[in-house]
Amino acid sequence: MATAERRALGIGFQWLSLATLVLICAGQGGRREDGGPACYGGFDLYFILDKSGSVLHHWNEIYYFVEQLAHKFISPQLRMSFIVFSTRGTTLMKLTEDREQIRQGLEELQKVLPGGDTYMHEGFERASEQIYYENRQGYRTASVIIALTDGELHEDLFFYSEREANRSRDLGAIVYCVGVKDFNETQLARIADSKDHVFPVNDGFQALQGIIHSILKKSCIEILAAEPSTICAGESFQVVVRGNGFRHARNVDRVLCSFKINDSVTLNEKPFSVEDTYLLCPAPILKEVGMKAALQVSMNDGLSFISSSVIITTTHCSDGSILAIALLILFLLLALALLWWFWPLCCTVIIKEVPPPPAEESEEEDDDGLPKKKWPTVDASYYGGRGVGGIKRMEVRWGEKGSTEEGAKLEKAKNARVKMPEQEYEFPEPRNLNNNMRRPSSPRKWYSPIKGKLDALWVLLRKGYDRVSVMRPQPGDTGRCINFTRVKNNQPAKYPLNNAYHTSSPPPAPIYTPPPPAPHCPPPPPSAPTPPIPSPPSTLPPPPQAPPPNRAPPPSRPPPRPSV
């Protein structure tokens, strides 16, 4: 008894506040952001509920359990049915996807009067009748049964229940069992698909709420997206089907990807790999542009299908050979350009002294805001520079081969420490905004991964360019291949590295003054960090704007509560 209908043998006034809370929470079902997890799978869901005398004072808990779970399955293609059993099985609500009918069905469920024996097989019979009828109509939608019972089934009743559950399975259903209180787990494991398909609730009916999440996780089979969602007409492709629960099949070898083409022909393909959250499937070759293939998944070799709103469309793609030729031409041009660039280096080698750097090298940024080039530094304290007895540290900067002829010949003292810069260029740290927050990154684009790699390649090329450009002869330079010439500056070199400040007479213009290094922009920051978990793709049906109402509007007087 414990129903809203007579309404008594249930849980009493202490339930009223809890019921209100449950209804508020349940009203949020279907919105992943604030309503907890939800299921977007399109299949037929049957609740088979024990309403025998043993659940007399527990019907409220059963009702709230079903109500909360029902609101988590939010696909417009999901259909639901409520079946109750005691001495006989009754279909309280026939299979429907109509949210208003489901709301009414839940209202009726609340009015159930527990009583009678535990003839669970009667419940499975009512489910099988509907599955058989739906299959005969040609729908062949995947079926999931969630059966709830609270007691041990006597020998004959267990035999009948197992037999009827097997019939439902033969029709393509996946069977889960929820056992509450005095259930026999071994029995339920045989009625359900396996031990993994049994949800034990040992702490009594009040603990039913605690398994909603795990039931949802295990029973939900959903297709969320396909990648790519557009394929080339006439080409063979592989499709990654993203979703959940693909390994919930009794046998993963029986999982199939199904493509319903233009709402007529259905092509089934065996996936290359089956993971819980994705399938890798060969896509059918669709000859014409504009063809649409609705994606479905079968967990039982095509006996029945989980539907989705995910569509794969075909588009016209240019011939690959044109692209190949274009790439080849581009490659040849690049080869010629490189040859043109590097050929003079083979023929004329000009060795000259690098003009000395300014006496005071500061670590600060250049006018363009970029740090200066780093050179290796030697702690010259050991040579006796800077102060009495050479105690104060003095750093001398080294050019590539020494900044002067003498410098080039200079050897390090045995105990001189050389610090090599860690990288040729230091890129400025990304500037922090106030309160240490990094500037928000731009949204990740489809080309972000490629762009990141190209940026890295570009940096390497620029480094190479800068190194080569220093050595590259200018138009006035002469020389033959493998004909080395040393050009010497007239200006005497002073040690240590302070030529810049020698002003007695201006030095003659050098044969070649290396151009300043090309300004080095730091590579653009990666387009975005790892993107946030995407909300379900736009191909999915949006969850209902407002979740289906949980109840009819309250009557003028509060309905009497079941007694406890």
């Epitope: 008894m1 129903t3 809203a4 209908e5 007579r6 309404r7 008594a8 043998l9 849980i11 009493g12 006034f13 005398g53 043993s54 007399l56 004072h57 527990h58 005691s86 006989r88 009754t90 009726e108 009015k111 159930v112 009067l113 009583g115 009678g116 209180k181 009594g204 009916f205 009040q206 309905p559 009497p560 509560r561 079941p562 007694s563 406890v564």
Partner: antibody
């Protein structure tokens, strides 16, 4: 106010059937199930069963299975038919409403006398 | 079935006195939800039974607070303080824990 009105007394011969009624008023009939209780001199009070006025399904005391059949109709009336009457079936039969507090409302009772 | 046993079968009492009626069940009536499903009824002569106490200790609507119920899982007591003449009749206990619901045999309260 809530009222349960039972049909009048019945004098019947052994072996026949009798159908007694209980009409609910002052509330939404289908919101509350209906119990039937037998009171005889020998056995004091005995619970016969309860019927869902919404769905029409009933739960019986095993002892009364085959003897009593409970039904409801759209006129806010619950019925109980007693079959193959014997002198042991002579008693007062009450209907009582299920509720948050069950058995808070009772009909006035119907006396059934089985006599040759 | 759960068997309900009432004692004594009959109790004579003087108006203004207090009286206690006992009821025992063959099985604990304490449910896992915390409620004890024991009910007390009074049937006055020529009338239908009237609910006095529900779920062991809760007073039904319109019942004077001279009536009170107490007990454990299997032993229950209905206490009437300051008995009045209108309290005469047969008192029944009933278990509402599981089907079939069962009644005690009744205790007849008489005025001395």
């Amino acid at each position: 106010q809530v009222k349960l009105e039972e049909s009048g007394a019945e004098l019947v011969r052994p072996g026949v059937s009798v159908k007694i009624s209980c009409k609910g008023s002052g509330y939404t009939f289908t919101d509350y199930a209906m119990h039937w209780v037998k009171q005889s001199h020998a056995k004091s009070l005995e619970w016969i069963g309860v019927i869902s006025t919404y769905f029409g399904d009933a739960t019986y005391n095993q002892k009364f299975k085959g003897k009593a059949t409970m039904t409801v109709d759209s006129s806010s009336t619950a019925y109980m038919e007693l079959a193959r009457l014997t002198s042991e079936d002579s008693a007062i039969y009450y209907c009582a409403r299920e509720d948050y507090v069950p058995f808070a409302y009772w009909g006035q009772g119907t006396l059934v006398t089985v006599s040759a | 079935d759960i068997v309900m046993t009432q004692t004594p079968p009959s109790v004579p009492v003087t108006p203004g006195e207090s009286v206690s009626i006992s009821c025992r069940s063959s099985k604990s009536l304490l449910h896992s939800n915390g409620n004890t499903y024991l009910y007390w009824f009074l049937q006055r002569p020529g009338q239908s039974p009237q609910l006095l106490i529900y779920r062991m200790s809760n007073l039904a609507s319109g019942v004077p607070d001279r009536f009170s119920g107490s007990g454990s899982g299997t032993a229950f007591t209905l206490r009437i303080s300051r008995v009045e003449a209108e309290d005469v009749g047969v008192y029944y206990c009933m278990q509402h824990l599981e089907y079939p619901f069962t009644f005690g045999s009744g205790t007849k309260l008489e005025i001395k």
